[in-house]
Interface confidence: medium
């Protein structure tokens, strides 16, 4: 399996945005790569977002996706927005080299994203 590296822990900012780098050791000459972010919480795994991109081009997520990203070589810079405290969990980066053959797939160990809801501002008279 292809090796995928990602940071162990990331803290979302006060606006509920978290960014991390997902890096893969490409054993092939991929022209087309698919990146999927999975969230694992309470032994449940759900897909957060996914994008297929051509090497050297931008990642394109669906319009309503909470993810954005850029790619540079074998690195993908992922940003997840709109996070709240309840979204705290392990976010796993899955990378697939879709084309040309051979197909390779790798899954990272996951990035624990901590989200702290901001304290409501006290009313000021």
């Amino acid at each position: 399996a292809m090796h995928v590296a990602q940071p162990a822990v990331v803290l979302a900012n006060s606006r509920g945005t978290a960014s991390f780098v997902c890096e893969y050791a490409s054993p092939g000459k991929a022209t087309e790569v698919r990146v999927t972010v999975l969230r694992q919480a309470d032994s449940q795994v759900t897909e957060v977002c996914a994008a297929t991109y051509m090497m050297g081009n931008e990642l394109t997520f669906l319009d309503d996706s909470i993810c954005t990203g850029t790619s540079s070589g074998n690195q993908v810079n992922l940003t997840i927005q709109g996070l709240r405290a309840m979204d705290t969990g392990l976010y796993i980066c899955k990378v697939e080299l879709m084309y040309p053959p051979p197909y390779y797939m790798g899954i990272g160990n996951g990035t624990q994203i901590y989200v702290i809801d901001p304290e409501p501002c006290p009313d000021s008279d």
């Epitope: 022209t31 051509m54 879709m98 084309y99 040309p100 051979p102 197909y103």
Partner: antibody, heavy 120, light 112 residues
Framework: EVQLLESGGGLVQPGGSLRLSCAAS????????MNWVRQAPGKGLEWVSA????????YYADSVKGRFTISRDNSKNTLYLQMNSLRAEDTAVYYC?????????????WGQGTLVTVSS | QSVLTQPPSASGTPGQRVTISCTGS?????????VHWYQQLPGTAPKLLIY???QRPSGVPDRFSGSKSGTSASLAISGLRSEDEADYYC???????????FGGGTKLTVLG
């Protein structure tokens, strides 16, 4: 059940054009890369062209580069091969074939083929 | 001239074991790409017989087996039967040509 049905073959004069279609069913078309493979009468198999599932990556055999164009319409589950500047040596049965993604790729499923004859 | 080299013909009598070889190069089989085998019965489309060097799709009898070593691969058919009479092709991806390459095909004749 996976089904691939080629159409568009026929007799064409040298220098002419033809567009082949391959209608796919029984699988999620956009998830699979597709290929055209041809077989001249009494000869072996020759890979012609390939296109990735998204349509973003295309590859061609040197013998057809610059003359043939592979494309796909994922909304119609259809693969195409636009053949221009046809030559007598392009005469063959043209098969569309589906790649299989599972640790490696291979040409897992084939259509029954459509015959292209280039002759004056 | 095919990129992968196969013998043009092979033959055997019913019950015998026959082997068909497929020789490639450092840009295809030798580069680590898997070898796949196809059977083409007269007048029909090719059918996947062996994938990833030695794997059989469901429905293919275990009389058919494949192996790969270095830049070569082989297909073995044991307990030969008359219905095995067909053309057999090997295939692999080639990373210098960026495409699939095939052997020239081996015509198998079942004698008697």
């Amino acid at each position: 059940e996976v089904q691939l049905l080629e159409s568009g073959g026929g007799l064409v004069q040298p220098g002419g054009s033809l567009r082949l279609s391959c209608a796919a069913s029984g699988f999620t078309f956009s998830s699979y890369s597709m290929n055209w493979v041809r077989q001249a009468p009494g000869k072996g198999l020759e890979w012609v062209s390939a296109i990735s599932g998204s349509g973003g990556s295309t590859y061609y055999a040197d013998s057809v580069k610059g003359r043939f164009t592979i494309s796909r319409d994922n909304s119609k589950n259809t693969l195409y091969l636009q053949m221009n500047s046809l030559r007598a040596e392009d005469t063959a049965v043209y098969y569309c074939a589906r790649d299989r993604v599972e640790m490696n790729q291979w040409l897992a499923d084939w259509g029954q083929g459509t015959l292209v004859t280039v002759s004056s | 001239q095919s990129v992968l080299t196969q013998p043009p013909s092979a033959s055997g009598t019913p019950g015998q074991r026959v082997t068909i070889s497929c020789t490639g190069s450092s840009s295809n089989i030798g580069a680590g790409y898997d070898v796949h085998w196809y059977q083409q019965l007269p007048g029909t489309a090719p059918k996947l017989l062996i994938y990833r060097n030695n794997q059989r799709p469901s429905g293919v009898p275990d009389r058919f087996s494949g192996s790969k070593s270095g830049t070569s691969a082989s297909l073995a058919i044991s307990g030969l039967r008359s219905e095995d009479e067909a053309d057999y092709y090997c295939a692999a991806w080639d990373d210098s040509l960026n495409g699939w390459v095939f052997g020239g095909g081996t015509k198998l004749t079942v004698l008697g």
